[in-house]
């Protein structure tokens, strides 16, 4: 059974992941930066089901495309800290959260998503899991 300390650690990792995803979304949704419409050509795959930590496998598989689109977006008006570093940090958190005991084949929904829809989906996932832990 999960201990209170492991639950607390999980919660903190989810909060860190949530903040990273929100930071990216805030940069993209910055209306001072409509240049970023070019990012809408990129297609992201959404999980058919995302209710448990193991479903983060679906996010992990989309991190490479996410890095590519963020590299395209980098400009004077949209500047994240080193993109590679950011994605690497997200990857580390995702790997720890989903665990490596069971390898899940991610099931994707039929409908694809833009980067905005994709980030919103995973932000909602983080918020939902955090609320069950608190």
């Amino acid at each position: 059974a999960p201990t209170s300390s492991s639950t607390k650690k999980t919660q903190l990792q989810l909060e860190h992941l949530l903040l990273d995803l929100q930071m990216i979304l805030n940069g993209i949704n910055n209306y001072k930066n409509p240049k970023l419409t070019r990012m809408l050509t990129f297609k992201f795959y959404m999980p058919k089901k995302a209710t448990e930590l193991r479903h983060l496998q679906c996010l992990e598989e989309e991190l490479k495309p996410l890095e590519e689109v963020l590299n395209l977006a980098q400009s004077k008006s949209f500047h994240l800290r080193d993109t590679k570093d950011l994605i690497s940090n997200i990857n580390v958190i995702v790997l720890e959260l989903k665990g490596s005991e069971t390898t899940l084949m991610c099931e994707y929904a039929d409908e694809t998503a833009t980067i905005v829809e994709f980030l919103n989906r995973w932000i909602t996932f983080c918020q939902s899991i955090i609320s069950t832990l608190t």
Partner: antibody, heavy 121, light 108 residues
Framework: EVQLVQSGAEVKKPGESLKISCKGS????????IGWVRQMSGKGLEWMGI????????RYSPSFQGQVTISADKSISTAYLQWSSLKASDTAMYYC??????????????WGQGTTVTVSS | SYELTQPPSVSVSPGQTARITCSGD??????AYWYQQKSGQAPVLVIY???KRPSGIPERFSGSSSGTMATLTISGAQVEDEADYYC???????????FGTGTKVTVL
């Protein structure tokens, strides 16, 4: 009404220079990418390049890089396509188009009426 | 350079279904957009982001995408749908855009 109005038809000789224009109205011209598209007679559409009038960042098709220059003057809501030395093969219809955002994603939702360029000796 | 390949022509009887395909290596990760161009006119956006229809575009126009292939479907084709259709997308880098080779749709 959102629209793009292009300059009139041009007849030029090989080796001459040319600058055609595309004036936007009815929206914030600064905040939308503008693309240029070539269509030779009886042929398909060819993407030439895009410009973001807000800071004049441009992207060119490898096929048109070095052949044309795309520019914009946001103070008068106008984008330009220019040639320093025209060739007979530049004879075509040229369209400017606005890349959307919002409801049309990256789709080109507003098009100019087209400018016919004829290059002949 | 990146290419999007379409069939040169598609013929359909009025009321029947026309399907136009667009093939490109980057399409699993990049959205396709479809334009209709009638003779002597500027192109019009009929589908964006693979399957979304702009307001004012009839419901008979739909789009889908699977793997390296995007498809524009005209269900119950009308005589006024006779036009050239072009897909449009970007290469894998997202920096360069390209139109498909174009498909002439004839409604016989």
């Amino acid at each position: 009404e959102v629209q793009l109005v292009q300059s009139g038809a041009e007849v030029k000789k090989p080796g001459e220079s040319l600058k055609i224009s595309c004036k936007g109205s009815g929206y914030n011209f600064t905040n939308y990418w503008i693309g240029w598209v070539r269509q030779m007679s009886g042929k398909g559409l060819e993407w030439m390049g895009i410009i973001y009038p807000g800071d004049s960042e441009t992207r060119y098709s490898p096929s048109f890089q070095g052949q044309v220059t795309i520019s914009a003057d946001k103070s008068i809501s106008t984008a330009y396509l220019q040639w320093s030395s025209l060739k007979a093969s530049d004879t075509a219809m040229y369209y400017c188009a606005r890349h959307g955002g919002g409801w049309s994603g990256w789709g080109m939702d507003v098009w100019g009426q087209g400018t016919t360029v004829t290059v002949s000796s | 350079s990146y290419e999007l390949t379409q069939p040169p022509s598609v013929s359909v009887s009025p009321g029947q279904t026309a399907r136009i395909t667009c093939s490109g290596d980057a399409l699993p990760r990049k959205y396709a957009y479809w334009y209709q161009q009638k003779s002597g006119q500027a192109p019009v956006l009929v589908i964006y982001e693979d399957s979304k229809r702009p307001s004012g575009i009839p419901e008979r126009f739909s789009g889908s995408s699977s793997g390296t292939m995007a498809t524009l479907t005209i269900s119950g084709a009308q005589v006024e749908d006779e036009a050239d259709y072009y897909c449009y997308s970007t290469d894998s880098s997202g920096n360069h855009y390209v139109f498909g080779t174009g498909t002439k749709v004839t409604v016989l």
